[in-house]
C-alpha cells in the first residue's frame, strides 16, 4: 500500500516500527486498551464483566471503575453492605437479613436500629382488663385487677372460683403442666 511510519498510521498513541519484510511496511505496537493493525480498535475491557452484583462498568481510560448498585461497594462491588457480616446488634439482639436490607431483632426490653435503646415493655399496655404493668429485668409482670388472672390478665375468674381457661387437650386437666 506504500504507507510507512512517516505517514503516522498508528492511532491512539501506538508506536510505529518499520516492517522487517517488504510485505509489511510498518507494524503498530498498541498501548494498553487498543488493538487492530493500526491500533484503531478500543478493547472493550468492560466486556469481561468485572463488576459484580449488577454494578456498571466504567472504562475511564487509565483504569476501569465499577459503579455499584445501592447496597454494594468496593472496587468490584464485591462488598454487600446489606448483609449481616460485621453487623453488631447490641444487648443480645440478632441480625436478620431480608429484602435487600438488614435489621436487628432485639431482645426483650431493647429497641432501636441496633438494639441500643432501652424499650419500655409496658408501653404497649400488655396487661388486659385494667391490670397494672411492672417492668422487670426479665420482661414484664402484670398485676391483675380483681376478677382476672393469667400472665396478661386475659382470663376472667368466675364467681364459683373456676376460671375460664381455654379447653385443655384430651387427657389433660386444667392446671396440669403440659409435657
Amino acid at each position: 500500500s506504500g504507507v510507512t511510519c512517516a505517514d503516522g498510521p498508528c492511532f491512539n498513541g501506538g508506536l510505529c516500527v518499520g516492517g522487517a519484510d517488504p510485505d509489511s511496511a510498518y507494524i503498530c505496537h498498541c498501548p494498553p486498551g487498543f488493538q487492530g493493525s493500526n491500533c484503531e480498535k478500543r478493547v472493550d475491557r468492560c466486556s469481561l464483566q468485572p463488576c459484580r452484583n449488577g454494578g456498571l462498568c466504567l472504562d475511564l481510560g487509565h483504569a476501569l471503575r465499577c459503579r455499584c448498585r445501592a447496597g454494594f461497594a468496593g472496587p468490584r462491588c464485591e462488598h454487600d453492605l446489606d448483609d449481616c457480616a460485621g453487623r453488631a446488634c447490641a444487648n443480645g439482639g440478632t441480625c436478620v437479613e431480608g429484602g435487600g436490607a438488614h435489621r436487628c431483632s432485639c431482645a426483650l426490653g431493647f429497641g432501636g436500629r441496633d438494639c441500643r435503646e432501652r424499650a419500655d415493655p409496658c408501653a404497649a399496655r400488655p396487661c388486659a382488663h385494667g391490670g397494672r404493668c411492672y417492668a422487670h429485668f426479665s420482661g414484664l409482670v402484670c398485676a391483675c385487677a380483681p376478677g382476672y388472672m393469667g400472665a396478661r390478665c386475659e382470663f376472667p375468674v368466675h364467681p364459683d372460683g373456676a376460671s375460664a381457661l381455654p379447653a385443655a387437650p384430651p387427657g389433660l386437666r386444667p392446671g396440669d403442666p403440659q409435657r
Epitope: F11, L60, G61, H62, A70
Partner: antibody, heavy 123, light 112 residues
Framework: QSVEESGGRLVTPGTPLTLTCTVS????????MSWVRQAPGKGLEWIGI?????DPYYASWAKGRFTISKTSTTMDLKITSPTTEDTATYFC????????????????????WGPGTLVTVSS | ALVMTQTPSSVSAAVGGTVTINCQAS??????LAWYQQKPGQRPKLLIY???NLESGVPSRFKGSGSGTEYTLTISDLECDDAAIYYC??????????????FGGGTEVVVK
C-alpha cells in the same frame, strides 16, 4: 504533560459558549478528562468528565446545561444557555489513578490542571 | 448524594506550627480521597492521592491519613508558602450518586 483552557469571555445570558481544553504530552484516548469550575470567591465544583473512549458523565445539576465532547487533541465544554450563575473560572484537568485491581483501596485524582479561563455572564 | 464536609473553614497558625484539616464523607469512600492546594489566582495543585500517598515533589511536611468516612490533612513545620486554600475530593462509584467527584468546601490556612 500539560493542559490549557481557552475560549473564556464576556457573554450575555442565553448566548451559547464553547470552551476548549488543549492537551500536550499525552493522548486523550488514554485518559479521562474533567471540567471543574470556581465562581469568584467560592470553592471548586465538579461539572463532568469524558472518558478515554469518549463517554461523557455529568454532575446531576450540570445535565442539560453543559455538553462535553472531544477530538484527538482537544476537549470542549459547551455552556448551552449561560446564566449569571455560570460566571466562573473554568478549569480542565486530566484524571489519573490506580490501574484497575483487586485491591480494596484504589484512587483517582486530577493532575495536571490548566490555569483556567474566565467566563463572565452579564447583560 | 455523596457530600464532602470540610472543617474548619479557616485555620490560623504560626510559622513552624502544625495545622489539621478534616474531611468527612457522607458514605464510606474506601480511601479514594485526594487533597489539593490552591493559592489565590492559581490553579489547584495535587498534594495527596489515595488518602495518604504523597504526590511527587510535595514536601513530606504534608501528611494525609484516614479511612472510611473520616480523613485528615496535617501540615507540620508550617511555612509562609503554605498559606492557601486546601480542598479534599473523592471519587465514589455508585449508580445512585449525582456527583461522581465532589469537592469539600475548602479550608483556608493562614500562616502568621
Amino acid at each position: 504533560q500539560s493542559v490549557e483552557e481557552s475560549g473564556g469571555r464576556l457573554v450575555t445570558p442565553g448566548t451559547p459558549l464553547t470552551l476548549t481544553c488543549t492537551v500536550s504530552g499525552f493522548s486523550l484516548s488514554r485518559y479521562a478528562m474533567s471540567w471543574v469550575r470556581q465562581a469568584p470567591g467560592k470553592g471548586l465544583e465538579w461539572i463532568g468528565i469524558i472518558t478515554g473512549g469518549g463517554d461523557p458523565y455529568y454532575a446531576s445539576w450540570a445535565k442539560g446545561r453543559f455538553t462535553i465532547s472531544k477530538t484527538s487533541t482537544t476537549m470542549d465544554l459547551k455552556i448551552t444557555s449561560p446564566t449569571t450563575e455560570d460566571t466562573a473560572t473554568y478549569f480542565c484537568a486530566r484524571m489519573i489513578g490506580s490501574e484497575y485491581a483487586s485491591s480494596s483501596e484504589y484512587y483517582d485524582a486530577f493532575d495536571p490542571w490548566g490555569p483556567g479561563t474566565l467566563v463572565t455572564v452579564s447583560s | 448524594a455523596l457530600v464532602m464536609t470540610q472543617t474548619p473553614s479557616s485555620v490560623s497558625a504560626a510559622v513552624g506550627g502544625t495545622v489539621t484539616i478534616n474531611c468527612q464523607a457522607s458514605q464510606n469512600i474506601y480511601s479514594n480521597l485526594a487533597w489539593y492546594q490552591q493559592k489565590p489566582g492559581q490553579r489547584p495543585k495535587l498534594l495527596i492521592y489515595g488518602a495518604s500517598n504523597l504526590e511527587s515533589g510535595v514536601p513530606s511536611r504534608f501528611k494525609g491519613s484516614g479511612s472510611g468516612t473520616e480523613y485528615t490533612l496535617t501540615i507540620s513545620d508550617l511555612e509562609c508558602d503554605d498559606a492557601a486554600i486546601y480542598y479534599c475530593q473523592s471519587a465514589y462509584y455508585t449508580t445512585s450518586v449525582d456527583v461522581l467527584y465532589p469537592f469539600g468546601g475548602g479550608t483556608e490556612v493562614v500562616v502568621k
